[in-house]
């Protein structure tokens, strides 16, 4: 293990929407911060195979798969995707690490799959495996929240059975009429599922996820029924 190179695999998300197929590049576009992909030696594999965390992206998203290699001397490399070889141009960063990148622009179904990077260094040969899939947003749902009283406690739980899991917040207002609009200073927001203190004339629970936001108002009659 000590003789193996230190490999770091990262994912870079891009904000732009340029149309292109996957291409090997040493100069990724302007982008968000790199996200570590936890590259580790694949258990019980023949040869030295590193694997990166499975990557799931939205249709049309642009990403870069990047590998940083801390190994002495020069490296040569080759990307393989669906039996096609793609050219590979490693460069070296300021810490003298070899950097290899694969840019996938405007993600489509045809670009999903396994990306294999073969690297040859002066010390050893190894393979890095990336699995890229498209996020299935057809399964996404956003349901209106409902309330449940917590057992043995004077508290209310707000539940929204949505996918992906929503962020739940209580919106509490202490005065009547127009001033209970969300931007009003009379409105208090608590981003939590459990509400221990019930106060205000207008109590709502809201759930939000990628599909939007849904709210349910709590009426006094609900307190007796939850």
């Amino acid at each position: 293990n000590q003789d193996l190179p230190v490999i770091k695999c990262v994912l870079i998300n891009h904000k732009n929407n340029d149309s292109s197929v996957g291409k090997s590049s040493s100069y990724p576009m302007v982008s968000e911060s790199p996200e570590d992909l936890g590259c580790a030696l694949r258990p019980q594999s023949s040869g030295t195979v590193y694997e990166a965390a499975a990557v799931e992206v939205d249709v049309s998203a642009s990403i870069t798969l990047q590998v940083l290699v801390d190994a002495p001397g020069n490296i040569s490399c080759l990307w393989v995707f669906k039996h096609s070889s793609l050219n590979c141009q490693p460069h070296f960063d300021l810490q003298n690490r070899g950097v290899v990148s694969m840019v996938i622009l405007k993600m489509t179904e045809t670009q999903a799959g396994e990306y294999l990077l073969f690297i040859q260094s002066e010390a050893t040969n190894y393979t890095i495996l990336f699995t890229v899939s498209i996020r299935n947003t057809l399964l996404y749902t956003l349901r209106r929240p409902y309330f449940r009283k917590m057992e043995n406690q004077d508290a209310l739980v707000c539940i929204s059975e949505s996918v992906p899991e929503p962020i739940v917040e209580w919106v509490l207002c202490d005065s009547q009429g127009e001033s209970c609009k969300e931007e009003s200073p009379a409105v208090v927001k608590k981003e939590e599922k459990v509400l221990h203190e019930l106060f205000g004339t207008d109590i709502r629970c809201c759930a939000r996820n990628e599909l939007g936001r849904e709210c349910t108002r709590l009426f006094t009659i609900d307190l007796n029924q939850t």
Partner: antibody
């Protein structure tokens, strides 16, 4: 650089609800199959696994504590929140969060990075 | 829940010794087992994953073996920095469970 940091109250009264937050950086739940474990360790005792949540919202809880635990995540804040109801002095422990990495070929790596832990004391 | 039984619960050894710690699962867990090292006041550190794979940056004197119900962590030549408590963790079945720990002390 990957980091995880636990935060929450140092002191909790019996019967109260504990809310702990694990704030992560250097990775996200957005596009990679990542997860977070919560683990605790009472003073001088062994580690105990509490719960986990994955980027796809798959979650699981310790059998003995399931009725008291809720785990959730907020992708926009890079946070995982664990709530534990009806706290008791026996829940006094150091609470840790640790990363889980899920791989396309079906295996996973547990705890390649950990937070430094936060000591929670339950006392009236 | 799957019970993980570690043995011994503590051991005394000298620098240079070969140390073996075992972990037994109450049912088969294939190779879904990790080994962790913890020093007082510190968070645990991953040493071995998938029963026998060495985590990046961990010295090669640490090795793991086993499959099914019986697993072993071996330190081939104990170093001063290895005096700590070691835990196994199974992630084959929910709930995931730790062993009770093995404290390695200086003889």
């Amino acid at each position: 650089q990957v980091t995880l940091k636990e935060s929450g109250p140092v002191l909790v009264k019996p019967t109260e609800t504990l809310t702990l937050t694990c704030t992560v950086s250097g990775f996200s739940f957005n596009n990679a199959r990542m997860g977070v474990n919560w683990i605790r360790q009472p003073p001088g005792k062994a580690l105990e696994w509490l719960a986990h949540i994955f980027s796809n919202d798959e979650k699981s809880y310790s059998t003995s504590l399931k009725s008291r635990l809720t785990i959730s995540k907020d992708i926009s804040k890079s946070q995982v929140v664990l709530t534990m109801t009806n706290m008791d002095p026996v829940d006094t422990a150091t609470y840790y969060c640790a990363r889980i990495v899920g791989y396309g070929s079906g295996w996973r790596l547990l705890g390649d990075y950990w937070g430094q832990g936060t000591l929670v004391t339950v006392s009236s | 829940a799957i019970q993980m039984t570690q043995s011994p619960s503590s051991l005394s050894a000298s620098v240079g010794d070969r140390v073996t710690i075992t972990c037994r699962a109450s049912q088969g867990i294939t190779n879904d087992l990790g080994w962790y090292q913890q020093k007082p006041g510190k968070a645990p550190k991953l040493l071995i994953y998938a029963a026998s794979s060495l985590q990046s940056g961990v010295p090669s004197r640490f090795s793991g073996s086993g499959s099914g119900t019986d697993f072993t962590l071996t330190i081939s030549s104990l170093q001063p920095e290895d005096f700590a408590t070691y835990y196994c963790l199974q992630d084959y079945n929910y709930p995931w469970t730790f062993g009770q720990g093995t404290k390695v002390e200086i003889k």
